[in-house]
């Protein structure tokens, strides 16, 4: 089995992983996730992109097999998706305009898009950050 199969990204029945949010509570909406608001970037059959998911099902330490590894601390939101569109939303977090394109010292960061598009398939290629958009890469 090819360990690079994007295990969650093209599931027919669409179990979509949503990264835990930090800093904002909303524990009631998100059940027992650690820190709250869930962002889901997959399309449903109706073609609606879900932003904030207020699903409180099965949020306690979900464990999902992904590409030969185990991911914990994410919340599985069960919903049917268009075949092939049940992708992981690596694009999570609250955006503040003044946080874009800045490094730790506040200097503009090279090579970063000012409006980074949502790429629901990105987790197959990048380790996702649930912390949002602020950038930390002092390149000494």
């Amino acid at each position: 089995m090819d360990v690079f199969m994007k295990g969650l990204s093209k599931a027919k029945e669409g179990v979509v992983a949503a990264a835990e949010k930090t800093k904002q509570g909303v524990a009631e909406a998100a059940g027992k996730t650690k820190e709250g608001v869930l962002y889901v970037g997959s399309k449903t059959k109706e073609g609606v992109v879900h932003g904030v998911a207020t699903v409180a099902e099965k949020t306690k330490e979900q464990v999902t097999n992904v590409g030969g590894a185990v991911v914990t601390g994410v919340t599985a939101v069960a919903q049917k998706t268009v075949e092939g569109a049940g992708s992981i939303a690596a694009a999570t977090g609250f955006i503040k305009k003044d946080q874009l394109g800045k490094n730790e010292e506040g200097a503009p960061q090279e090579g970063i898009l000012q409006d980074m598009p949502v790429d629901p398939d990105n987790e197959a290629y990048e380790m996702p950050s649930e912390e949002g958009y602020q950038d930390y890469e002092p390149e000494a």
């Epitope: 295990g7 820190e35 590409g67 601390g73 690596a90 090579g111 996702p128």
Partner: antibody
């Protein structure tokens, strides 16, 4: 100066447990995803586990899932690896390593510690 | 089952160039993978050299000489670490690494010998 200092290694019998620690300094610890990477004697590098900056997401290699637990205490700038049900094949030097966050992603590890040796033998 | 394949060894003369390959077996889009390269000398931890996704998205590690550069061969699904002007201190093990769907993966490593 960036420093990652691992500790907690040692000799343990098969089936036993160890807890590794990694003390970080010289960078914004909470903004880095941290990983444990190991290297068996004479072998290559093997990624073991990773944890996001807030600790909200953790990742494990198949070879250790269900036995190892990664965690972090950002108030202490410390990373941990709790290793249970240890096997002979877990014998290795264990490195603590970190990768910076940018936007929605974490980069790979660009900061590495010197490593701590774990020997599992009866 | 290796997903990142590196030749076990490579040797070259001082002053020459060495091209280290890292072949990626993947069902994903090769162009989207960011390939990391590390150097490790005996008794020392790995050191980050560089990462390469494209000419527009690459990064050289702090203090890493420009003799070290990254590229990709899309036709072979391979990442390439090019070391030009080889020096005796370049003799080391070199590892590539990528992230894919919930895990970091390392190649098996290439032992580079600088002859002479």
């Amino acid at each position: 100066e960036v420093q990652l200092l691992e500790s907690g290694g040692g000799l343990v019998q098969p089936g036993g447990s160890l807890r590794l620690s990694c003390a970080a300094s010289g960078f914004t610890f909470s903004s880095y995803a941290m990983s444990w990477v190991r290297q068996a004697p004479g072998k290559g590098l093997e990624w073991v586990s990773a944890i996001s900056g807030s600790g909200g997401s953790t990742y494990y290699a198949d070879s250790v899932k269900g036995r190892f637990t990664i965690s972090r205490d950002n108030s202490k700038n410390t990373l941990y690896l709790q290793m249970n049900s240890l096997r002979a094949e877990d014998t290795a030097v264990y490195y603590c390593a970190g990768g910076a966050r940018r936007g929605r992603i974490y980069y790979g590890m660009d900061k590495w510690g010197q490593g701590t040796t774990v020997t599992v033998s009866s | 089952q290796a997903v990142l394949t590196q030749p076990a060894s490579l040797s070259a003369s001082p002053g020459a160039s060495a091209s280290l390959t890292c072949t990626l077996r993947s069902s994903g889009d090769f162009s989207r993978y960011r390939i990391y390269w590390y150097q490790q000398k005996p008794g020392s931890p790995p050191q980050y050299l560089l990462r390469y996704k494209s000419d527009a998205d690459k990064h050289q590690g702090s203090g890493v000489p420009s003799r070290f550069s990254g590229s990709k061969d899309a036709s072979a699904n391979a990442g390439i670490l090019l070391i030009s002007g080889l020096q005796s201190e370049d003799e080391a093990d070199y590892y590539c690494m990528v992230w894919s769907s919930g895990a970091w993966y390392f190649g098996g490593g290439t032992k580079l010998t600088v002859l002479g």
